[in-house]
């Protein structure tokens, strides 16, 4: 908290401008109107300001917009904003992309901080959904803010906004993630043909029922091992050795080297011998031959 | 990306010294500079500054006519020629670019 004392004589700031970094602090606060301050929040960022004298600067806006800042001034905070704190931010109501985007480039380079989540926060949910336009923004500056989000959030994520999703937007997602977004990328893609289809819809197949695997497997789509290890397990497990050696077309032979691994080591568990050594990979652990298999499941349903 | 000031020493009074402020991963053309001081125990203050074109320049009350701010775009770097050194100089020096000052800083003793 700074001092309240009188502005000397001849140092009344006129306009926002390079002289005030000379100014001590005290001087900033006493000699920089809050309301000059708020019309000139542009010319702030061309300043180099101490940390010290953007503090009263934040400082004097506080005082002046006790409520939260109006959209014309978050636009120009620049570097200032990195001086907000969340609960600053949860005052504000941004609702333009322009000042998202100026807000998120003075972060550029950075992990995604507490002030940045909040701000991402307040926005969308002043939009009441991530449409296209948000999601390519966010996923350009945050490349993993998709799977950032609950299940619960990324329900409003609307079919059209699935076109912004590059593949490495989902690289830290979770199954229960992918559950959510694979309907959405399935209805988003529905009028593509089967070659681009299968590229488009490649990354989200880890929320991927095992219906639509095996109509994957009709089609030739040479599935490669580390998009297939990503699938869910219970998925999986009802595959055939036919429908997993279409799947995979000449991929087929990489099951040797993740055998122990999931979900192909259950998978492994649920086939006949006999089907495996089909495959001439020397794949181990499936049924002994004249075996009998219950599936209890199909048990319980029917009981 | 960061700036790299160097230059400081130990100089008698009255005596010079010019310290640099180095651009590291981005070009300093389009930038404002500050050089900024701080020392022991005082509040960082303001020295100099120059304009990006270099068109326009400003220097706090304390060191007007002994301090120069100069800059040489293609070798990335502002420069601060520091004459008539006095006691009261001895700080360590920052520099930033339109942004706070984020570098280590040279130390300058004026003994």
């Known amino acids: 908290e700074v001092e309240k004392t009188a502005c000397p004589s001849g140092k009344k700031a006129r306009e926002i401008d390079e002289s005030l970094i000379f100014y001590k602090k005290w001087e900033l606060e006493a000699c920089v109107d809050a309301a000059l301050l708020a019309t000139q929040m542009d010319r702030v960022n061309a300043i180099p300001f101490t940390y010290e004298q953007l503090d009263v600067l934040k400082h004097k806006l506080d005082e002046l917009y006790p409520q939260g800042y109006p959209e014309s001034v978050i636009q120009h905070l620049g570097y200032l904003f990195l001086k907000m704190s969340p609960e600053d931010i949860r005052k504000w109501n941004v609702t333009s992309l322009e000042t998202l985007k100026a807000l998120l480039e003075v972060n550029k380079g950075h992990e995604m901080s507490p002030q940045v989540a909040t701000l991402i926060d307040r926005f969308v949910k002043g939009r009441g959904q991530l449409d296209k336009d948000t999601l390519d923004t966010l996923t350009a500056f945050y490349p993993g803010y998709l799977c950032s989000l609950s299940p619960e959030e990324l329900s409003s994520v609307p079919p059209s906004s699935i076109w912004a999703v590059r593949p490495q937007d989902l690289d830290t997602c979770d199954p229960r993630q992918l559950d959510v977004l694979y309907p959405k990328a399935r209805l988003a893609f529905q009028n593509m043909n089967g070659s681009e289809y299968f590229v488009k819809i490649q990354s989200f197949l880890g929320g991927a029922p095992t219906e639509d695997l095996k109509a994957l497997s009709q089609q030739n789509v040479s599935m490669d091992l580390a998009t297939f290890m990503k699938l869910r397990t219970d998925a999986v497990l009802p595959l055939t050795v036919a429908e997993v050696q279409k799947l995979l077309g000449p991929h087929v032979e990489g099951l040797k080297a993740e055998e122990r691994h999931r979900p192909v080591r259950d998978w492994i568990l649920r086939q006949r011998q006999d089907d495996l050594d089909t495959l001439g990979l020397g794949l181990q652990g499936g049924i002994p031959n004249g075996y009998l298999v219950l599936d209890l499941s199909m048990q319980e349903a029917l009981s | 990306l960061q700036l790299v000031e160097s230059g400081g020493g130990l100089v008698q009074p009255g005596g010079s010294l010019r310290l640099s402020c180095a651009a590291s991963?981005?070009?300093?053309?389009?930038?404002?500079i500050g050089w900024f001081r701080q020392a022991p125990g005082k509040e960082r203050e303001g020295v100099s500054y120059?304009?990006?074109?270099?068109?326009?320049?400003n220097y706090a009350d304390s060191v007007k006519g002994r301090f120069t701010i100069s800059r040489d775009n293609a070798k990335n770097t502002v420069y601060l020629q520091m004459n008539s050194l006095k006691p009261e100089d001895t700080a360590v020096y920052y520099c930033?670019?339109?942004?706070?000052?984020g570098g280590q800083g040279t130390l300058v003793t004026v003994s």
């Open positions: 991963g981005f070009t300093l053309d389009y930038f404002a």
């Open positions: 120059i304009s990006s074109s270099g068109g326009s320049t």
């Open positions: 930033a670019a339109d942004w706070p000052p």
